[in-house]
């Protein structure tokens, strides 16, 4: 018999009080954690890392810091104004030996368009990345460097889920041993060749991503080469065989009726917590219809919400979700018509998702008013359109060229949108701020780590 492969990286996910404040409830926070983990699980499972396949992720434990924990002295993430390096360090100061990786999710607007930060794994002699154990460093503190952090905010705007999922995959990619992509083979989005360029950059691109191009949620060959070397050496140290769901992680998985966490976390009157005996844990209590852990259409009193209750707000591209009185799930809602304006008139709805550019409404394609083409820097945060496959026609929506469509009205990109050919993000003043991909690295050189660690942290 062949022994089952160790291919599952178990995660500890914490969220800070600001993440909770934005999403509003424990259930909504757990849904976010679940969606992020499922997204990276799909990406990694479908990547062949030089013969190592089916790499998957499982949440082993979560900790949700609510707004009530904002003043709790035992909550290391309670401080309001922390830079990104300090935030990662606070995560790393905890002991995470029981996990493959430990992440903190936040809703903070870090400087310079930084959406995440993580320690980079290496095949040997590494400090950082997957399976790294807690040890004493030269600043006299014990640290776990199997860590990373991500934020869902950028220049005052919240990033779309697809971008946040790619940010998570990117940071975990660092933990798995991949540096940023470089060179023509691995940064096709920077190519002068239009055919290559249109597929965009890969997950480990150093700067900005829109998340909707073909390559955006794939690893480059450069990343695959680096990650496979680290997996070869490290996965036996802490990866586990995939299999049984983990009762207590807050996510309802195959074979579970509900999951409200461990006894210290379970606030649910409906579900037996994970500290209960085998036959009872993660099962509904007798006489209870449902548990809020199953979905937003279950009340705290363990009954299905009535037929008229709203469970999902009306969005730019889909009608509101309404409970139906017989399940905890919030049912799918109908999409709004294709080409309905969305994201403040910068995009259009396609199949219920705010996915296309406003240019598509008029049979045009979005393009970048990029400074390398001699365009005015002031236009870098304008929505620009061109005739299909004809970059020479690229012009701002406010230009005379497109006045018949936009009546001379300049449509500006949302703050936090990629600009200047994905080199940066628009700020609130509509300036394109270039991403300094290695900014935190430089700042860390002045901080507490010994010189040999400099190369092992990355955005």
């Amino acid at each position: 018999t062949t022994s089952a492969e160790k291919n599952t990286c178990q995660l500890y996910i914490q969220t800070d009080h600001l993440f909770f404040k934005y999403y509003g409830t424990r259930e909504a926070v757990i849904a976010q954690i679940s969606s992020h983990v499922k997204a990276i699980d799909t990406i990694y499972q479908t990547t062949d890392f030089s013969g190592i396949r089916n790499i998957s992720f499982m949440v082993k434990r979560i900790r949700i810091n609510t707004t009530a924990d904002e003043k709790d002295p035992t909550n290391p993430f309670r401080f309001p104004n922390i830079g990104v390096e300090k935030f990662l360090e606070l995560n790393s100061e905890q002991n995470h030996d029981d996990y493959c990786l430990a992440y903190v999710f936040t809703d903070r607007d870090f400087d310079d368009g930084v959406l995440g930060l993580a320690w980079v794994g290496a095949p040997s002699g590494s400090s950082g990345g997957i399976c790294e154990k807690s040890k004493l460093y030269s600043d006299g503190k014990k640290k776990s460097l199997n860590t990373g952090i991500i934020t869902v905010q950028n220049y005052g705007s919240h990033v779309p889920p697809k971008v946040s999922h790619i940010t998570f995959a990117h940071e975990v990619g660092h933990n798995f041993g991949s540096p940023h992509d470089s060179g023509t083979e691995c940064t096709p989005g920077e190519s002068k060749n239009l055919g290559q360029k249109e597929n965009g950059n890969y997950i480990m691109y150093a700067r900005a991503t829109s998340g909707d191009k073909l390559n955006n949620n794939k690893f480059s060959l450069c990343s695959i080469r680096n990650i496979s070397q680290v997996l070869e050496k490290k996965r036996n140290n802490c990866f586990v065989e995939s299999g049984q769901p983990i009762c207590g992680n807050g996510m309802v998985e195959q074979g579970e009726e509900c999951d409200c966490g461990y006894s210290d976390q379970c606030k649910d009157e409906c579900c037996f917590d994970a500290n209960q005996p085998e036959g009872r844990k993660c099962k509904l209590k007798p006489g209870k219809q449902c548990s809020p852990s199953q979905g937003p259409c279950c009340t705290a009193q363990c009954a299905f919400k009535s037929k008229s209750e709203k469970c999902r707000d009306d969005s730019d591209c889909a009608r509101e979700g309404i409970c139906n009185g017989f399940t905890a799930l919030c049912p799918a809602s109908d999409p709004k018509p294709n080409f309905t304006d969305c994201n403040r008139h910068t995009q259009v709805c396609i199949n219920g998702q705010c996915a296309g550019s406003i240019c598509e409404k008029y049979g045009l394609e979005e393009c970048t008013c990029a400074s390398s083409d001699g365009k005015d820097d002031k236009e870098l945060c304008h929505v620009c359109c061109m005739k299909k496959m004809d970059p020479s026609t690229c012009a701002s929506t406010g230009s005379v060229q497109w006045s018949r469509h936009f009546s001379g009205r300049t449509i500006t990109l949302q703050p936090g949108s990629p600009c200047n050919d994905f080199r940066g993000y628009c700020d609130v003043f509509m300036r394109c701020r270039l991403v300094d991909a290695d900014g935190p690295l430089a700042r860390l050189k002045k901080a507490i780590f010994s010189p040999e660690l400099y190369e092992n942290i990355a955005e």
């Epitope: 479908t46 996510m251 195959q254 799930l329």
Partner: nanobody, 116 residues
């Protein structure tokens, strides 16, 4: 992008049975919630059966005891077994799955017509 393909519909007499299938690429039905919906002419689309991520099932009162939702993870397929069909079950039937917390885009659906 998740693509869902429903099949198994057809014309059946009242009291008869049909088994609808919903296929998807990849093993997306594992640990994800699934729903069967229907839309009768001139009416809103409504959910008739749900399977939660853990495998628990729920049914609308109008189909309880007659319809059964199930999934086969190995085949990446979800089923809706419909027994004791009534003329009022006539509709286009759709399946949907929650992927990364969001319902997927609708497929084409499969027409079920129950004659009296």
């Amino acid at each position: 992008k998740v693509q869902l393909v429903e099949s198994g519909g057809g014309l059946v007499q009242a009291g008869g049975s049909l088994r609808l299938s919903c296929a998807a690429s990849g093993n997306i039905f594992i640990n994800n919630a699934v729903g069967w919906y229907r839309q009768a002419p001139g009416k809103q689309r409504e959910m008739v059966a749900a399977m939660l991520s853990g495998g628990s099932t729920n049914y609308a009162d109008s189909v309880k005891g007659r319809f059964t939702i199930s999934r086969d993870n190995a085949k990446n397929t979800v089923y809706l077994q419909m027994n004791s069909l009534k003329p009022e079950d006539t509709a286009v039937y759709y399946c949907n799955v929650q992927v990364n917390g969001t319902w997927a885009r609708w497929g084409q659906g499969t027409q079920v017509t129950v004659s009296s």
